[in-house]
């Protein structure tokens, strides 16, 4: 597994990471840490493992956290109720 750096699919990344689109270069995907408590997220980000190529810049939240709405268009990783 690729621990950091360029990737194509989740399977190339280490545990606790996903293969998300780079925030600097949209044509590149990089192994990115899953969302921690308080991190921004999107509720429809594909769960890990995803077998296709992601479009989002962020990974889903870590296990035990959920991507919850805090205001109209803002979602963050929070502890599951």
């Amino acid at each position: 597994a690729v621990i950091t750096g360029a990737c194509d699919k989740d399977s190339q990344c280490g545990g606790g990471m996903c293969c998300a689109v780079s925030i600097w270069v949209k044509s590149i995907r990089i192994c990115t840490p899953m969302g921690k408590l308080g991190d921004s997220c999107h509720p429809l980000t594909r769960k890990v493992p995803f077998f296709g190529r992601r479009m989002h810049h962020t990974c889903p939240c870590l296990p035990g956290l959920a991507c919850l709405r805090t205001s109209f268009n803002r979602f963050i990783c929070l502890a599951q109720k």
Partner: antibody, heavy 121, light 111 residues
């Protein structure tokens, strides 16, 4: 060749339940999610929900929450839709549709032939 | 829920002419610079067929006379040169927010 073959038409009474099956072939079943969509006679399309065929995790349209259950049997590469407490307005063609794995675009690239469910007393 | 409104409800176009279908979302379906909008074609008695995903990406095997454009709340499906086999109902679908919702459909006929 990717194929989704659904079970046959059903006639049910109000208050009953129905379970529709969708057998997949021609691809790695657990690598793709499966959606369910319905279409009332002469009407448009309505998304019911989807399931990860890998983990079994589901996401449902809140409109159907509590009445719908989507499951998979990995050993037979089959997805199931169960809808309970049927009413006349549930009369529709029910489609399973494979997610195309186009990232978060959730596009449905292969569809079953549809199963007509008629709810009538 | 995001409401998708297509216009017109139906249109008749001569063979070889351009057909344009519009779809308006009740709120933006963009995220991180991408537009989460799909287009489907449905012929009578058949299931829908995916034409365009993520607003402008042509599905494999779909003729290149079909194209999608737009961002935010306003999207367009264009058939550059209408063929007889394009007679169908066309649906837009947003996939940026659960529940995924479809437009009411636009029926395309030959004039």
């Amino acid at each position: 060749e990717v194929q989704l073959v659904q079970s046959g038409a059903e006639v049910k009474k109000p208050g009953a339940s129905v379970k529709v099956s969708c057998k997949a072939s021609g691809y790695s079943f657990t690598d793709y999610d499966m959606h369910w969509v319905r279409q009332a006679p002469g009407q448009g399309l309505e998304w019911i929900g989807y399931i990860s065929c890998y983990s079994g995790a589901t996401t449902y349209n809140q409109k159907f929450k509590g009445r719908v259950t989507i499951t998979v049997d990995k050993s037979t590469s089959t997805a199931y839709l169960e809808l309970s407490s049927l009413r006349s307005e549930d009369t529709a063609v029910y489609y399973c549709a494979r997610d195309g794995n186009y990232g978060e675009a959730y596009a449905m690239d292969y569809w079953g032939q549809g199963t007509l469910v008629t709810v009538s007393s | 829920d995001i409401v998708m409104t297509q216009s017109p409800d139906s249109l008749a176009v001569s063979l070889g002419e351009r057909a344009t279908i519009n779809c308006k979302a009740s709120q933006s379906v963009d995220y991180d610079g991408d537009s989460y909008m799909n287009w489907y074609q449905q012929k009578p008695g058949q299931p829908p067929k995916l034409l365009i995903y993520a607003a402008s990406n042509l599905e494999s095997g779909v003729p290149d006379r079909f194209s999608g454009s737009g961002s935010g709340t306003d999207f367009t499906l264009t058939i550059s040169s209408l063929q007889a086999e394009d007679v169908a109902v066309y649906y837009c679908q947003q996939i940026n927010e659960d529940p995924f919702t479809f437009g009411q459909g636009t029926k395309v006929e030959i004039k």
